[in-house]
């Protein structure tokens, strides 16, 4: 998260940490007891190491008693996710076992409407992805509230040049952005699950170069499919 | 497929005004900006401006802000420009052309003849 | 605003011919995001422009590979690298870095 701030510890009680071999990699968003959102771009280089989910977390590194890691069962892309892409962007990841739920560990509810959210919109994104142009990784769990922005500018040459589809949503990036590290993370409107941090190789920070965001609601009857 | 097409163009006499429509469909209107090209007889292109179909917000060439204005009905997908207090050289081809990617969607132009 | 100057303002040639349009700037077109926004177009008489090349180099989807973008900072350039028959037409370049957008007066290719 670039331009952000430290969380409050747990605030977030939805938030995740797609682990790679004991480090993390992506952000994620638990939406059931037993699944969590991320972004499939995440485990195109996982091949054979082992992916594990980190919930009730606030520091990576420091004890804490909500902390604990979950195996997966089970990991499904979105079917018509695609390397070179940034379209349906979307992975779920099944925990070997439902998660203890608490204070610290909650799922978040997700939009099911699928209607733009209207441009100008406060919405927070949060994650350990990196905090400045050099790379430095956060120990502790950062947010940033960006403003939504409308999908014709987003769309313009000087922007993402007509790459952003329905089911895609853009939020201003002028210094205060998410980055690398922070994709499969959520974007929340209003107390609601709306987007994914997309994870293409994106600049973070310039304004001419918005956020990328996946719309769950545009992806709800898979949602439903596969948590079924 | 995404199409544009153009129409109210024709006659007019000079000093006069006249309404242009740009009727888009095979996408989402508010999705993207939509921009106005013109093309005098056996000249090049010469950019009008733009218009955010969502905000409303307009860009304009200085050359047009005075007489030229854009405006929409997104239940129509529909983009317009009016043009008012028309010359002689205001005579070409007039398009409208969206913008992402690049120019890569035009509609097929619709003539405006300014004349006495 | 920021002219663009094209050379030549049309030229004769026969099938199979490499071709070359030069565009020059009054000034830089890179753009404050780092990227360069220079585009060329073709138009046939009678019809709306065609995008062929965006970003200076990068050909638009389903066009032939015998066109070719290249340049930076004020000098871009437009190959055919062999013209045939469907490729005589009208080529404007156009950058968009800048407010207002602006086209170059175009290079009418003709057949010889």
């Known amino acids: 998260i670039l331009g952000g701030r430290e969380a409050e510890a747990h605030a977030r009680p939805y938030m995740a940490s797609v682990q790679l071999n004991g480090a993390h990699l992506c952000g994620g968003v638990l939406v059931a007891e037993q699944w969590v959102l991320s972004a499939a771009h995440c485990l195109e280089d996982a091949a054979d190491g082992k992916v594990q989910v980190l919930l009730g977390a606030h520091s990576l590194s420091q004890p804490e008693p909500s902390k604990r890691l979950y195996d997966v069962l089970r990991a499904v892309p979105h079917p018509d996710s695609q390397p070179d892409t940034i379209d349906h962007d979307l992975l779920l990841l099944q925990l070997s076992e439902k998660a203890t739920l608490g204070p610290a560990v909650r799922p978040l509810p997700w939009q099911r409407v699928d209607r733009d959210v209207a441009p100008g919109t406060l919405c927070d994104v949060a994650g350990w992805g990196i905090v400045n142009h050099a790379g430095r990784r956060p120990d502790s769990l950062q947010h940033v509230l960006l403003p939504v922005l409308d999908r014709a500018t987003c769309n313009r040459r000087t922007h993402h040049d007509g790459a952003i589809t329905e089911r895609l949503m853009c939020a201003e990036s002028n210094r205060r952005d998410s980055c690398k590290g922070d994709s499969g993370g959520p974007l929340v409107c209003g107390g609601v699950l709306e987007g994914v941090v997309t994870s293409g190789s994106r600049v973070c920070g310039n304004r001419k170069k918005p956020g990328i965001y996946t719309r769950v609601a545009s992806y709800a009857a898979w949602i439903d499919s596969v948590l079924a | 497929e995404v199409q544009l097409v153009e129409s109210g163009g024709g006659l007019v006499q000079p000093g006069g005004s006249l309404r242009l429509s740009c009727a888009a469909s095979?996408?989402?209107?508010?999705?993207?900006?939509m921009n106005w090209v013109r093309q005098a007889p056996g000249k090049g292109l010469e950019w009008i401006g733009d218009?955010?179909?969502?905000?409303?917000?307009?860009d304009y060439n200085a050359d047009f802000k005075r007489r030229f204005t854009f405006s929409l009905d997104t239940s129509k997908s529909t983009a317009y420009l009016q043009m008012n207090s028309l010359r002689a050289e205001d005579t070409a081809v007039y398009y409208c052309?969206?913008?992402?990617?690049?120019?890569?969607?035009w509609g097929q132009g619709t003539l405006v003849t300014v004349s006495s | 605003d920021i002219q663009l100057t094209q050379s030549p303002s049309s030229l004769s040639a026969s099938v199979g011919d490499r071709v070359t349009i030069t565009c020059r700037s009054s000034?830089?077109?890179?753009?404050?995001?780092?990227?360069?926004?220079l585009e060329w177009y073709q138009q046939k008489p009678g019809k709306a422009p065609n995008l062929l090349i965006y970003?200076?180099?990068n050909r638009f989807s389903g066009v032939p590979s015998r066109f070719s973008g290249s340049g930076s900072g004020t000098d871009f350039t437009l190959t055919i690298s062999s013209l045939q028959p469907e490729d005589f037409a009208t080529y404007y370049c156009?950058?968009?870095?800048?407010?207002?957008?602006?086209f170059g007066q175009g290079t009418k290719v003709e057949i010889k």
């Open positions: 095979g996408y989402k209107f508010t999705s993207y900006y």
């Open positions: 156009f950058q968009g870095s800048h407010v207002p957008v602006t």
């Open positions: 970003k200076v180099s």
């Open positions: 218009i955010n179909p969502v905000t409303g917000d307009t």
């Open positions: 000034q830089t077109i890179v753009h404050s995001n780092g990227d360069t926004y």
């Open positions: 052309t969206r913008e992402g990617p690049s120019f890569a969607y």
